[in-house]
C-alpha cells in the first residue's frame, strides 16, 4: 500500500500532502517542500524530511564524535538538495554559493568551498552509534530485556531488518545502539540505517514523524524507559576529508 486508502494519509510521514490522484484514484502522497511522491509503506528519506522541515528550522542536531573519523553535525539544519530517489546529493550548496560534500545522512564531510568544489560520490554512512541516557529508575533494566525491546522497536516501528542492528550495549544509565549497513548488504526495499536513526531521534525528542500513531512509548517489562538525551555518531565507509583537525 502507498498510503492509507480510507482517509488518504501517509502513516509513515506526517509532513506530506495526500490526495486520491494516483493511478486508479489511489491515494498518493507528496513530501512538503519537494513535492516528491513518497512510499508510505516505509520510512521517507532523511533528505526529503529535512527539506520539508525547513519551514520550521528548530532543534538543530549536535553530535559528538567517538573517534577521529566520526562526524559531528554541528552545521545544524539546512535546506538540502535531494536526488530523484530522495537521497542527499553528494554536493550541497547554500544561497551564497558556498558548497561542501556530505555523506549519505547529509552530514558535511569536507571543508566548505565554492561552486568549483567537486564531490565525486555520495559516501555511505555504514555505522551509526546511537548513544542514549535514560532517566533514573528504581534499578537497572535487565540487559537482555532492554536489548530485545530495542531490537523489536527498530523492526516493528522503523521496519529495519534485524540484521542491521549490530549490538545493544547497556551500562546504566547509558544505552548504545549500534546500526551497521554496508552498501553491499543493503538490498532493494531495505530501510536505510540513517533514516531509521533519524526517525528514532525525532521519536525520542517527542517529534514523531508518524501520522496517526501514538508517540514513542518505550517500556521494558512494563517499566517506562524515558530518554534524557541522545547523541548520534556517524562513521563513513571512506573517512572524511578535512584540511585540519576540527
Amino acid at each position: 500500500h502507498t498510503a492509507a486508502q480510507d482517509n488518504c494519509t501517509c502513516p509513515t510521514n506526517k509532513m506530506t500532502v495526500c490526495s486520491p490522484d494516483g493511478p486508479g484514484g489511489r491515494c498518493q502522497c507528496r513530501a512538503l517542500g519537494s513535492g516528491v511522491a513518497v512510499d508510505c509503506s516505509t520510512l521517507t528519506s532523511e533528505c526529503l524530511l529535512l527539506k520539508a522541515r525547513m519551514s520550521a528550522p528548530k532543534n538543530a542536531r549536535t553530535l559528538v564524535r567517538p573517534n577521529e573519523h566520526a562526524l559531528v553535525d554541528n552545521d545544524g539544519l539546512y535546506d538540502p538538495d535531494c536526488d530523484p530517489e530522495g537521497r542527499f546529493k553528494a554536493r550541497q550548496c547554500n544561497q551564497t554559493s558556498v558548497c561542501w560534500c556530505v555523506n549519505s545522512v547529509g552530514v558535511r564531510r569536507t571543508d566548505k568551498g565554492d561552486l568549483s568544489l567537486r564531490c565525486d560520490e555520495l559516501v555511505r554512512t555504514h555505522h551509526i552509534l546511537i548513544d542514549l541516557r535514560h532517566r533514573p529508575t528504581a534499578g537497572a533494566f535487565n540487559h537482555s530485556d532492554l536489548d530485545a525491546e530495542l531490537r523489536r522497536l527498530f523492526r516493528e516501528r522503523y521496519r529495519l531488518h534485524p540484521k542491521f542492528v549490530a549490538a545493544v550495549h547497556y551500562e546504566q544509565p547509558t544505552i548504545q545502539i549500534e546500526l551497521r549497513q554496508n552498501t553491499s548488504q543493503k538490498a532493494a526495499g531495505d530501510v536505510d540505517i540513517g533514516d531509521a536513526a533519524y526517525y528514532f531521534e525525532r521519536d525520542v525528542k517527542g517529534e514523531s514523524l508518524f501520522q496517526g500513531r501514538g508517540g514513542l512509548d518505550l517500556r521494558v517489562r512494563g517499566e517506562p524507559l524515558q530518554v534524557e538525551r541522545t547523541l548520534i555518531y556517524y562513521l563513513d565507509e571512506i573517512p572524511p576529508k578535512f584540511s585540519m583537525k576540527r
Partner: antibody
Framework: QVQLQQSGPELVKPGASVKMSCKAS????????IGWVKQRTGQGLEWIGE????????YYTEKFKGKATLTADTSSNTAYMQLSSLTSEDSAVYFC??????????WGQGTTLTVSS | QIVLTQSPAIMSASPGEKVTMTCSAS?????MYWYQQKPGSSPRLLIY???TLASGVPVRFSGSGSGTSYSLTISRMEAEDAATYYC?????????FGGGTKLEIK
C-alpha cells in the same frame, strides 16, 4: 526456498525435560529471528518468546520464563527450545517461525509434545 | 499486555458470500497481522501491516482498521477459505494473538 524443519513428536513423562529443534534452510540464518508459539489441541496460538540469531538476544513472555529455554547453533542453522519440569499443561504443538521486519513470515510444521505417565 | 478479542468465534458462509470478521485490541496498536490455519497445518501469514496481502494470497482477502479496531474481509467465500483465522499484534511485548475465528463453509 525458505524452510523450517522441526523435530518429530515427543512423548515424555511428567517432571522431565524435552528439547526440540527447528532447522532452517534457504536464508542466512544469523540475519533473522526465530520465535516459538504454543498451540494446545483445539486452542489458539500463544507466543513463548524469540531469539535474535545474530546476537543471541532472547526475550521470553513472563509465563514461559523458567519453563522455556531458547538457544541456537549457528554452525548447523538450528534453533532449539527446551521445556523443563513438564506437566500435562505443556502437552501441545509447538511451532517455530522466522521473524524479520514481520513478526512471523515462515512457520515450521510443528512438533507435537505429549506429557503422560 | 495487549489483549486481542476476535468475533465471532465461529461463523459459516456459503460459497460466493461476503465474510467479515473483527479483531478488537485492548489498547491501540500500530498494525494488525492476520494468519490462516487449516486443521493439521501450521499458520500462514495472510495479511501484514493491517491491509497488505502476503505473497500468494488471493485478492478476495482484504484487511482494514486502525487503533483498536481491525477487520478481515473475504469478498467472495470459497471452499478453500474454510479455516481458523488469527489476528496478531507486535506493537509491544509480549506479542499476542486473538482467540481465533473459525470459518466454516455452508
Amino acid at each position: 526456498q525458505v524452510q523450517l524443519q522441526q523435530s518429530g513428536p515427543e512423548l515424555v513423562k511428567p517432571g522431565a525435560s524435552v528439547k526440540m529443534s527447528c532447522k532452517a534452510s534457504g536464508f542466512t540464518f544469523t540475519d533473522y529471528v526465530i520465535g516459538w508459539v504454543k498451540q494446545r489441541t483445539g486452542q489458539g496460538l500463544e507466543w513463548i518468546g524469540e531469539i535474535y540469531l545474530g546476537s543471541g538476544t532472547i526475550y521470553y513472555t513472563e509465563k514461559f520464563k523458567g519453563k522455556a529455554t531458547l538457544t541456537a547453533d549457528t554452525s548447523s542453522n538450528t534453533a532449539y527450545m527446551q521445556l523443563s519440569s513438564l506437566t500435562s499443561e505443556d502437552s501441545a504443538v509447538y511451532f517455530c517461525a522466522r521473524g524479520s521486519i514481520f513478526p512471523f513470515d515462515y512457520w515450521g510444521q510443528g512438533t507435537t509434545l505429549t506429557v503422560s505417565s | 499486555q495487549i489483549v486481542l478479542t476476535q468475533s465471532p468465534a465461529i461463523m459459516s458462509a456459503s460459497p460466493g458470500e461476503k465474510v467479515t470478521m473483527t479483531c478488537s485490541a485492548s489498547s491501540s496498536v500500530s498494525y494488525m497481522y492476520w494468519y490462516q490455519q487449516k486443521p493439521g497445518s501450521s499458520p500462514r501469514l495472510l495479511i501484514y501491516d493491517t491491509s497488505t496481502l502476503a505473497s500468494g494470497v488471493p485478492v478476495r482477502f482484504s484487511g482494514s482498521g486502525s487503533g483498536t479496531s481491525y477487520s478481515l474481509t473475504i469478498s467472495r467465500m470459497e471452499a478453500e477459505d474454510a479455516a481458523t483465522y488469527y489476528c496478531q499484534q507486535w506493537s509491544s511485548y509480549p506479542y499476542t494473538f486473538g482467540g481465533g475465528t473459525k470459518l466454516e463453509i455452508k
